[in-house]
């Protein structure tokens, strides 16, 4: 699987879409998981409704929601109030028994103005007062990467 990059602005909502063959995955529940390390397990974040026929109903775990268009073959994950710690590698999965097929590998990038993450006293240029928080949904930007093209950031 190639990795698809989805970019969302910090504080906004990011929609990740995972297309799949609706016939091949007929009757299967879906899940969104976070990859823990390059070779580590994929930790389940949220999965679709226990009853496959109700997969269109939005299920939520914290700030992450999932819904499945089983006829159209599109799994949609929404990350609300995107934060820097949301950045990283994820997978969309199709579940069958205790097994899981990968539908798409995803890299979430959280966008912010580079000055946002300096302490107020760290701005070399005079700081302006922060403005209102708006809540519109960020229409995600996505692009494909070759497998392994972006390494995991080093841990400190």
């Amino acid at each position: 699987h190639n990795t698809t990059v989805f970019q969302g602005v910090e504080g906004q909502s990011l929609q990740v879409s995972c297309p799949y063959d609706s016939m091949k995955h007929w009757g299967r529940r879906k899940a969104w998981c976070r990859q823990l390390g390059e070779k580590g397990p994929c930790q389940r974040v949220v999965s679709t409704h226990n009853l496959w026929l109700l997969s269109f109903l939005r299920r939520r775990n914290g700030s992450t929601a999932i819904t499945d268009d089983t006829l159209g073959g599109t799994l949609t994950i929404t990350l609300r109030n995107l934060q820097p710690h949301d950045a990283g590698f994820y997978q969309c999965q199709s579940l069958h028994g205790s097994e899981a097929d990968t539908l798409r590998k995803v890299l979430v990038e959280v966008l912010a103005d580079p000055l946002d993450h300096r302490d107020a006293g760290d701005l070399w240029v005079p700081g302006e007062s922060e403005s209102f928080e708006d809540a519109h949904v960020e229409h995600s930007i996505s692009r494909s990467l070759l497998e392994g093209e972006i390494p995991f950031p080093p841990t400190s």
Partner: antibody, heavy 114, light 112 residues
Framework: EVQLVESGGGLVQPGGSLKLSCATS????????MHWVRQASGKGLEWIAH??????????YYAESVKGRFTISRDDSKTTIYLQMNSLKTEDTAVYYC?????WGQGTTVTVSS | DVVMTQSPLSLPVTPGEPASISCRSS???????????LYWYLQKPGQSPQLLIY???NLASGVPDRFSGSGSGTDFTLKISRVEAEDVGVYYC?????????FGQGTKVEIK
């Protein structure tokens, strides 16, 4: 006084490697996202790499033109950033600047030629 | 990639007269904090770029107040109220929100 001083540029053959350094002082380096930007002779500015702070797990980002060949890193204890450049191509010939976006170094020249 | 388009690419100016440079981005640069991540730089001949305006309209430290920045989420303008001889060089707009970060092609300002 804020200072950013690049070094490590020079002449290298295609396929070769170079490591650029950027020593900084005069600002709280560890909190600042740092970048490398290059400029070919007579051309415009091209952003090529970016490294975030420790609080962001030193996340790195690259322009497609250098991805897989260049590696940005930082040493907060030395307030220095680096750019390891491998598999160099003639089109990598440029002046390389390090920057925190508000202040810039004077640049170091990299020439890739046989 | 976000495309930054500047106009004009060359701008002959008369000292003491106003001057204006436009920059358009192919997508909005407005963040959730109401900040617009648009920056303006001046690169004087033989020098490194220097920051003039950050976040669309904020004057960087040490920059004369004859410079000002304005705009919306996608259309931006750098204005010089009264051009001085030291203002010659290449002006670049840049977006630092979406990866990869991108610069405009540059506008060369020279004295008539």
């Amino acid at each position: 006084e804020v200072q950013l001083v690049e070094s490590g540029g020079g002449l290298v053959q295609p396929g070769g490697s170079l490591k650029l350094s950027c020593a900084t002082s005069g600002f709280p380096f560890s909190n600042v996202w740092m970048h490398w930007v290059r400029q070919a002779s007579g051309k415009g500015l091209e952003w090529i790499a970016h490294i975030k702070a420790k609080s962001d797990n030193y996340a790195t980002y690259y322009a497609e033109s250098v991805k897989g060949r260049f590696t940005i890193s930082r040493d907060d204890s030395k307030t220095t950033i680096y750019l390891q450049m491998n598999s160099l191509k003639t089109e990598d010939t440029a002046v390389y600047y390090c920057t925190g976006l508000d202040y810039w170094g004077q640049g170091t020249t990299v020439t890739v030629s046989s | 990639d976000v495309v930054m388009t500047q106009s004009p690419l060359s701008l002959p100016v008369t000292p003491g007269e106003p001057a204006s440079i436009s920059c358009r981005s192919s997508r909005s640069l407005l963040t959730s904090k109401g900040i617009t991540s648009l920056y303006w730089y001046l690169q004087k001949p033989g020098q490194s770029p220097q920051l003039l305006i950050y976040r669309m309209s904020n004057l960087a430290s040490g920059v004369p107040d004859r410079f000002s920045g304005s705009g919306s989420g996608t259309d931006f303008t750098l204005k010089i109220s009264r051009v001085e001889a030291e203002d010659v060089g290449v002006y670049y707009c840049a977006q630092f929100l979406v990866y990869p970060y991108t610069f405009g092609q540059g506008t060369k300002v020279e004295i008539k």
